[in-house]
């Protein structure tokens, strides 16, 4: 666990045990400040040559409970004339994120870390033309 | 807390206190299985009309300790001829993710949830032309 500090203030803590049971404060600390709004325009989803829509995914047993997932609007990209270009494909950019899932029936409440693959937006790539043998 | 079960197995647990101190198993459960590799082609970063590079961001006091961040290669998009198109901008798609940050000097180790804005990939948008007054 690279999360264990090099100075290891708790030298007797076994890394494998440590990983299985750590205390977490789930009150979100906002280290981003005002940077978020200014750095992240939300209109790209409409203005992109590979536009996308966002779908609401809610799971009350997950932290965060609500995740908005992208889906490409078209299979192709939109050209300067607003028409679909059949030589260019609109593809989903996905990111693997970590979420916390509540362990069923746990008391006191415990969570496990789970990987989740989410669509974040779309980009435009040239179609790969398969050559006949 | 929507993580609290319907039957509220711990009825005396105050929701506000609950958020501040939960137990988490940091051993990642991969609910994605083999889907990850098949669903996430890594060549989009080169084939896109708005290509990007990935930079390694490591923080030993963070979970996950390694995060790969995207940066757009060009300010403009690449057209079918491989030239930069000055009417089209390459823009970074960012996502807000949650990471765990170790509380300094905590023993046993405790973490807080922190927001992080990461670049995931790039997309191509039409330049907005500002009209003169």
């Amino acid at each position: 666990a690279a999360i264990i500090p090099q100075s290891s203030a708790c030298p007797n803590t076994e890394a494998k045990d440590f990983l299985q049971n750590v205390k977490v404060n789930l009150k979100v600390f906002n280290s981003l400040g005002a940077k978020v709004s200014s750095r992240r325009p939300s209109d790209y989803l409409n203005r992109s040559t590979s536009p996308w829509t966002l779908h609401r995914n809610e799971d009350p047993d997950r932290y965060p409970s609500v995740i908005w997932e992208a889906q490409c609007r078209h299979q192709r990209c939109v050209n300067a004339e607003g028409k679909l270009d059949h030589h260019m494909n609109s593809v989903l950019i996905q990111q693997e994120i970590l979420v916390l899932k509540r362990e069923p029936e746990s008391c006191p409440f415990t969570f496990r870390v789970e990987k989740m693959l989410v669509g974040v937006g779309c980009t435009c790539v040239a179609s790969i033309v398969r050559q006949a043998a | 807390a929507a993580i609290i079960p319907q039957s509220s197995a711990c009825p005396n647990t105050e929701a506000k206190d609950f958020l501040q101190n939960v137990k988490v198993n940091l051993k990642v459960f991969n609910s994605l299985g083999a889907k990850v590799s098949s669903r996430r082609p890594s060549d989009y970063l080169n084939r896109s009309t708005s290509p990007w590079t990935l930079h390694r961001n490591e923080d030993p006091d963070r979970y996950p300790s390694v995060i790969w961040e995207a940066q757009c290669r060009h300010q403009r998009c690449v057209n079918a001829e491989g030239k930069l198109d000055h009417h089209m901008n390459s823009v970074l798609i960012q996502q807000e993710i949650l990471v765990l940050k170790r509380e300094p000097e905590s023993c046993p180790f405790t973490f807080r949830v922190e927001k992080m804005l990461v670049g995931v990939g790039c997309t191509c948008v039409a330049s907005i032309v500002r009209q003169a007054a």
Partner: antibody, heavy 121, light 106 residues
């Protein structure tokens, strides 16, 4: 303290559009979704839809899809709802309310004071 | 859509009396939320996630239930409790509200 300040009452003509605003203060705007709810004596409380200021995502109750458009401006911490092609059926009080994205357990915890819309010729 | 039926629609209680109102869902839901509304004001979150009292709500209020049957109880009615109470579900789209239970003081 948390506040959702809504725009004032409107008397509008049938067939026109109106935009309602909901200015948030006292919390991090992008940590919460903004949901909109309509109240009338006949239909009671009806959920219109949700806007996520962080991502720009929107989701609507099918009944209001095409009638309402939800947007948000992160720089001013303000959410908006445009109501189009107004008829007398659209008269009522409209509320904005916030919903924590990270923990849905809490539900819609703070509500604006409401905006009364009267559609009449 | 899930229909929430509240009963009784109107009720009155004397100070000190125990009050129970119910909310029945047309399909099973995970949680119920209760809002209190007084004339001319916006709804206030009163009970969330079936059991939890919102900040400032007196301890004489409680919530219970599961599946399709939920209730809000006031152990000892007080004049300030006179209001309309709405139940709400967000387990299934579209999110819906009950028609309300109007509680009056005798």
């Amino acid at each position: 303290q948390v506040q959702l300040q809504q725009s004032g009452a409107e008397l509008v003509r049938p067939g026109t559009s109106v935009t309602l605003s909901c200015k948030a203060s006292g919390y991090i705007f992008t940590d919460y979704e903004i949901h909109w709810v309509k109240q009338t004596p006949v239909h009671g409380l009806e959920w219109i839809g949700v806007n996520d200021p962080e991502s720009g995502g929107t989701f609507y109750n099918q009944k209001f899809d095409g009638k309402a458009e939800l947007t948000a401006d992160k720089s001013s911490s303000t959410a908006y709802m445009e109501l189009r092609s107004l008829t007398s059926e659209d008269s009522g009080v409209y509320y904005c309310t916030r919903y924590y994205r990270y923990e849905s357990f809490y539900g819609m915890d703070y509500w604006g004071q409401g905006t009364s819309i009267t559609v009449s010729s | 859509q899930i229909v929430l039926t509240q009963s009784p629609a109107i009720m009155s209680a004397s100070p000190g009396e125990k009050v129970t109102m119910t909310c029945s869902a047309s399909s099973s839901i995970s949680y119920i939320y209760w809002f209190q509304q007084k004339p001319g004001t916006s709804p206030k979150r009163w009970i969330y996630a079936t059991f939890e009292l919102a900040s400032g709500v007196p301890a004489r209020f409680s919530g219970s239930g599961s599946g399709t049957s939920y209730s809000l109880t006031i152990s000892s009615m007080e004049a300030e409790d006179a209001a309309t109470y709405y139940c709400h579900q967000r387990s299934s789209y579209p999110w819906t509200f009950g028609g309300g239970s109007k509680l009056e003081i005798k």
